[in-house]
Structures are given as structure tokens and as C-alpha cells.
Interface confidence: low
């Protein structure tokens, strides 16, 4: 049997042997284009391809439509994986979103969504997430139904005002709805009463912004 | 029933001050965000400020930044808005409006809401 080298995901990676937590490079869908990813492969079982993850605030967050569509950021850090990519890759298979939370206190705590997709750029990639349990309320913080995404040069969001530039970073906006993982990162001490800061209404409240988050997909039949 | 129901608008001078409230009955303000929006004949609404639901976090629109200032009793379940040196601008229709979500304590300006007061009139000028 031939071996596998190209993958379209982290699970696929896993499945094929490789069990340690890294860079690894994907491949688009029906395409040669490729992408770098983190792959957890330790969380529940592996097989995650993270497509977001903050932890120090050393990348930009309040970036354009473009950087948000391509991704930007480091794999081994701060990141986002790109708009594009995730559409067309939830768009082939059904996955699931996993949502890791950390506050300044030691807390952690999830959302795990059983059915997450990103429709294409000609819909702002408007996120569909079904399905949520978890420790990190039992609300959505993600507006439901989804919202299209919205960037500091791309108002989508349902609001007179521009959420994007108001609260920074580029997001799935509502008017302006209960989370921003791509807020404005305040250090310990600074993270409280903050209106632009990275939130997850359902869980800790109003103008609380977190430690450390990860976002991370992964097929649902793995 | 729920019901916001705005007062103290009125004419003023440049310069002059007023405070509006926005009270509320059918529900408990305390558990929503509260914003002030303004609206001239012919122009789009305009948010003007707001306040979260349970930390007090406020935001105002650049124009009335520091002559402006929002607050709540929720005990009375009001909420205020102090407007300060004002100026001919600031003329319009001012509404009140909270969000039965509960969570829009980070825009303050969304469409969102969807209890609305009937309007106050603030008319400045000399």
C-alpha cells in the first residue's frame, strides 16, 4: 500500500503515525496548495488541527479581510490559520469545533460544538456551529444563528456600529454579540473591565479578557 | 409588560447641561445593557453611549466623550445619561434601548435591541 503524503488534516496525520504534537503541512482540498497547522495531538484523543490560538499577545490580532482569509501569525505560537482554508476544508466532511479557555486565575474550560462549518468568502464566511457541551457555559458565546466575519476593513456584522474597529480583531461579529477570541490581549492585572478584550461572554462574564485560548477542529467520525 | 420609558430632555443653552433617565418596568435592568441612541429628522440613528449589565463598563461615541456620562441605579432600575457642556449638535430625538440577551455589554450600539423608549427631545440652543 502506497503511503500517504499529502494530508488535509491533522487526523489524517495521526491516522497515518504521527502521534506527536507539531508543524505539520496540510494541503487544500482538491488542490497542491499547502498550509502549515498545528496539530494537537495529545487533547482528547488527538488529531486537532488548531486554527486559532492566543497566549501572550505577541502577534497582531486586528488584522484585514486578506491576512484573516490566508491566516497569519506563528503555528508554534500565536496564530490564525485562515478563513479560506477552514471553509474549504469543513466544507468537504463534517467536523467538529473543540474551543479551549484559560483565565488569569488557573481555570480552564471548554465548548466543544458537534457540527462547525465556515461557508465560502462569497457568504463572509459565515460560521454554522451545532451542537454545544462543555464547561464554558451552557450558552452559546458564538451568536446563534452564525454570523458573517468581520474585519477592521470588512463591516459584516449586524451592528450600526463597526464591532471590528470598536472591539479589534476580526471575528464573527453579531451587534456585537457575547465573544471575541481575536480581541486586544491585556496581560494579568489589566484584564478586567476591558471592552476590546478576548471574551467568552458565557463563561466569565462582561469585560473579562482570558489568558489563552485554542480553537481546533476535527473530523466527526474520527 | 416591559417598558423603557426616557425623560429630561427639554431646551437648553450652549454650554448648558441636562440629565436624561431611562427608566424601566415589566423586568430588571440590571441583568441588560442599557444604551442611549439619538436621532436627527432625516439622518441615520446614532449610538451615543451605553452600559454593560453587571461591571458598569461604558462606552461613548467619540463626539461626546467627556462631556457625556452614563450611569445606572439599578435599585431604582434607571439608568441616566449626564450630558454636559452641550452643544448645538447635539440636538436630536435621544432614545433608550436594552437587549433581552443580555450580552451586547461590548458594542453598545447594536441592532440588537429590542426594548425601545418612545423618545425625549433635546433641543440646544440659544
Known amino acids: 500500500k502506497e503511503e500517504q503524503t499529502t494530508f488535509r488534516d491533522c487526523a489524517e496525520i495521526f491516522k497515518s503515525g504521527l502521534t506527536t504534537s507539531g508543524i505539520y503541512t496540510l494541503t487544500f482540498p482538491n488542490s497542491t496548495e499547502e498550509i502549515k497547522a498545528y496539530c494537537d495531538m495529545d487533547v482528547g484523543g488527538g488529531g486537532w488541527t488548531v486554527i486559532q490560538h492566543r497566549e501572550d499577545g505577541s502577534v497582531d490580532f486586528q488584522r484585514t479581510w486578506k491576512e484573516y482569509k490566508e491566516g497569519f501569525g506563528s503555528p508554534l505560537g500565536e496564530y490564525w490559520l485562515g478563513n479560506e482554508f477552514v471553509s474549504q476544508l469543513t466544507g468537504q466532511h463534517r467536523y467538529v469545533l473543540k474551543i479551549q479557555l484559560k483565565d488569569w486565575e488557573g481555570n480552564e474550560a471548554h465548548s466543544l460544538y458537534d457540527h462547525f462549518y465556515l461557508a465560502g468568502e462569497e457568504s463572509n464566511y459565515r460560521i454554522h456551529l451545532t451542537g454545544l457541551t462543555g464547561t464554558a457555559g451552557k450558552i452559546s458565546s458564538i451568536s446563534q444563528p452564525g454570523s458573517d466575519f468581520s474585519t477592521k476593513d470588512s463591516d459584516n456584522d449586524k451592528c450600526i456600529c463597526k464591532c471590528s474597529q470598536m472591539l479589534s480583531g476580526g471575528w464573527w461579529f453579531d451587534a456585537c454579540g457575547p465573544s471575541n477570541l481575536n480581541g486586544q490581549y491585556y496581560p494579568q492585572k489589566q484584564n478586567t473591565n476591558k471592552f476590546n478584550g478576548i471574551k467568552w461572554y458565557y463563561w466569565k462574564g462582561s469585560g473579562y479578557s482570558l489568558k489563552a485560548t485554542t480553537m481546533m477542529i476535527r473530523p466527526a467520525d474520527f | 409588560e416591559v417598558q423603557l420609558v426616557e425623560s429630561g430632555g427639554g431646551l437648553v443653552q450652549p454650554g448648558g447641561s441636562l440629565r436624561l433617565s431611562c427608566a424601566a418596568s415589566?423586568?430588571?435592568?440590571?441583568?441588560?445593557?442599557i444604551g442611549w441612541f439619538r436621532q436627527v429628522p432625516g439622518k441615520e440613528r446614532e449610538g451615543v453611549s451605553c452600559i454593560s449589565s453587571s461591571d458598569g463598563i461604558t462606552y461613548y461615541v467619540d463626539s461626546v466623550k467627556g462631556r457625556f456620562t452614563i450611569s445606572r441605579d439599578n435599585a431604582k432600575n434607571t439608568v441616566y445619561l449626564q450630558m454636559n457642556s452641550l452643544k448645538p449638535e447635539d440636538t436630536a430625538v435621544y432614545y433608550c434601548a436594552t437587549d433581552s440577551g443580555g450580552y451586547i455589554d461590548y458594542d453598545c450600539m447594536g441592532l440588537g435591541y429590542d426594548y425601545w423608549g418612545q423618545g425625549t427631545q433635546v433641543t440646544v440652543s440659544s
Open positions: 415589566g423586568f430588571a435592568l440590571d441583568y441588560y445593557a
